[in-house]
Amino acid sequence: IWELKKDVYVVELDWYPDAPGEMVVLTCDTPEEDGITWTLDQSSEVLGSGKTLTIQVKEFGDAGQYTCHKGGEVLSHSLLLLHKKEDGIWSTDILKDQKEPKNKTFLRCEAKNYSGRFTCWWLTTISTDLTFSVKSSRGSSDPQGVTCGAATLSAERVRGDNKEYEYSVECQEDSACPAAEESLPIEVMVDAVHKLKYENYTSSFFIRDIIKPDPPKNLQLKPLKNSRQVEVSWEYPDTWSTPHSYFSLTFCVQVQGKSKREKKDRVFTDKTSATVICRKNASISVRAQDRYYSSSWSEWASVPCS
Amino acid sequence: RNLPVATPDPGMFPCLHHSQNLLRAVSNMLQKARQTLEFYPCTSEEIDHEDITKDKTSTVEACLPLELTKNESCLNSRETSFITNGSCLASRKTSFMMALCLSSIYEDLKMYQVEFKTMNAKLLMDPKRQIFLDQNMLAVIDELMQALNFNSETVPQKSSLEEPDFYKTKIKLCILLHAFRIRAVTIDRVMSYLNAS
């Protein structure tokens, strides 16, 4: 048993039929010695008396909020949560496997630049009675600070008959140098509690591997005289690391017809302009990627040809 | 993805082209190692990230762009002697770059060159003949070192009398390639920055 936060404890259980469970001793936080009684989840059934209560925790029926009382007055509470281990594997019932980039991916993270700021998100089909807390560090044996905000519900989506809830959190490495070469990964740890069930999820990554620039900005077309060609120009996104001559981007320019089946023309360039042929009803899109380290491409920025 | 090949103008900062070739070569070699050594721990998640130049060179700090010198997190061990020799500077005056930066890059290349050559000698003795270092990568390292044109003592190639452990050698190759790729990215960024200065 270990303390998750004040008055909240996690009991780790091997989960199989007729498992013996864990013996837990609860102590009432009071100077009182006599006349103390214990209840579970504010039911009227008295579980025991005395300053300590010994319980055998085997299943969810044994978890919950234990309260010690004296003469109708509440003295203290202890909330017991369960962390299930089945066949040697901790349960992952609360979050959805996003299966990208590989199976058992519960947390996904992205950074818009090398500033040490990143966002992580996760999915669940659970709508209420759910709390998350997020911790992060650089490295694990001698951890360096990363500060994370509170996880918030960032999106709700309908998937077939079911609703899916996306939560996200923003974190910032306390002392990040954008030019640094990372040798220790960022560790992100999410504690998830659904009713009386506790689970934890982790992700480990280098900022360089989760970079996804914002789309190029100010995408503009300039028709070239007496030609079907246009000069497309754009700028680095505002959120990208500076100086741009050090943190350089490369770009992909795509001409796409109205129909998805039409052949796409693609040009790759390190410049912030390109000359392409603009077909009728087509659109021109540009996306960006770190020029030297091939992490994710940005989303497309698009303009119509007309 | 193949990085776009830049054809430098005669007046262009001469090392940019070489550094781009270096990054392309090390990225290709790393990809080849990952594929060939698929049953070895050779991915970024699996390996220990070791830097053989740690405490010997200070490339990141020495080559920091001026704009980042205001960032205290980047300044833990910043040296500030501004000098401008080395042929890559091609008589450009620059307040950003110091000889320390280019010589630090040169020292990095020299260290990796020695390590790779030693390792290749071991890999050539492997009866499985599973993987060898790409000669192109070694050549590109050499070309960039020549372009940098720093004179320094030759580091003797390490020779080892004991029987090589080929499994360990291949793991070390992965570690080395990952670290060298990261350093090659830094070198490319530096050269790009210098070229724009």
Epitope: D41, Q42, S43, S44, E59, F60, G61, A63, G64, Q65, V74, D93, T125, I126, S127, T128, D129, D161, N162, K163, K195, L196, K197 | -
Partner: antibody
């Protein structure tokens, strides 16, 4: 002892509103959700929504959104469920129940609402 | 929305016999399932929560099992006071949903 006591039966005309109360005693009101469940004559149970006074959260069944409002008064430990624009098919017994970790463990006695012109 | 489907709709059993009631969820609800008993003119009464945990004061002839999408309520030896309607309910994801109910009647 935990108890949930509901207000008495109501007869309403179509288009009118009804507000049912549920007074909770014997436990810390703020620690639990009060859920509202209805049962039309001879039918099964249908969940309408819930209200947590502790967190100020509501959780409504989409089917009743816009027509139902759930509130509470912590000074009297009383929860309320108001249903507007009543129709004849809203004729049912309306139950309040407390919920936290163990399902809906205590229920009110039910309030019969009859909608008839 | 998660749909809970109970079967059979009616179960005719003699006193002293075993009754097995089934409940299927349209998607996984982990073990967040409760079972309720309702007698005519009364409010429902909680029997089982977290799929297999007997609520305080519920006789041990009642037992629940299952996780994911398939759940079972078993009454090992029916007593006269057990003839009633039984509902399963998921509170894994909102909107909470009840099954249509299984009426256990005297054979």
């Amino acid at each position: 002892e935990v108890q949930l006591v509901q207000s008495g039966a109501e007869v309403k005309k179509p288009g009118a509103s009804v507000k049912v109360s549920c007074k909770a005693t014997g436990y810390t009101f703020n620690d639990y959700w009060i859920e509202w469940v209805r049962q039309a004559p001879g039918q099964g149970l249908e969940w309408m929504g819930g209200f947590s006074h502790g967190s100020g959260s509501t959780n409504y069944n989409e089917k009743f959104k816009g027509r139902v409002t759930m509130t509470a008064d912590s000074s009297t430990n009383t929860a309320y469920m108001e249903l507007r624009s009543l129709r004849s098919d809203d004729t049912a017994v309306y139950y309040c129940a407390r919920r936290r970790f163990r399902g809906m463990d205590y229920w009110g006695q039910g309030t019969t609402v009859t909608v008839s012109s | 929305e998660i749909v809970m489907t109970q079967s059979p709709a009616t179960l005719s059993v003699s006193p002293g016999e075993r009754a097995t009631l089934s409940c299927k969820a349209s998607q996984s609800v982990s073990n967040d399932v409760a079972w309720y008993q309702q007698k005519p003119g009364q409010a429902p009464r909680l029997l089982i929560y977290y799929a297999s945990n007997r609520y305080t004061g519920v006789p041990d002839r009642f037992s629940g099992s299952g996780s994911g999408t398939e759940f079972t309520l078993t009454i090992s030896s029916l007593q006269s006071e057990d003839f009633a309607v039984y509902y399963c309910q998921q509170d894994y994801s909102s909107p909470w949903s009840f099954g249509g109910g299984t009426k256990v009647e005297i054979k």
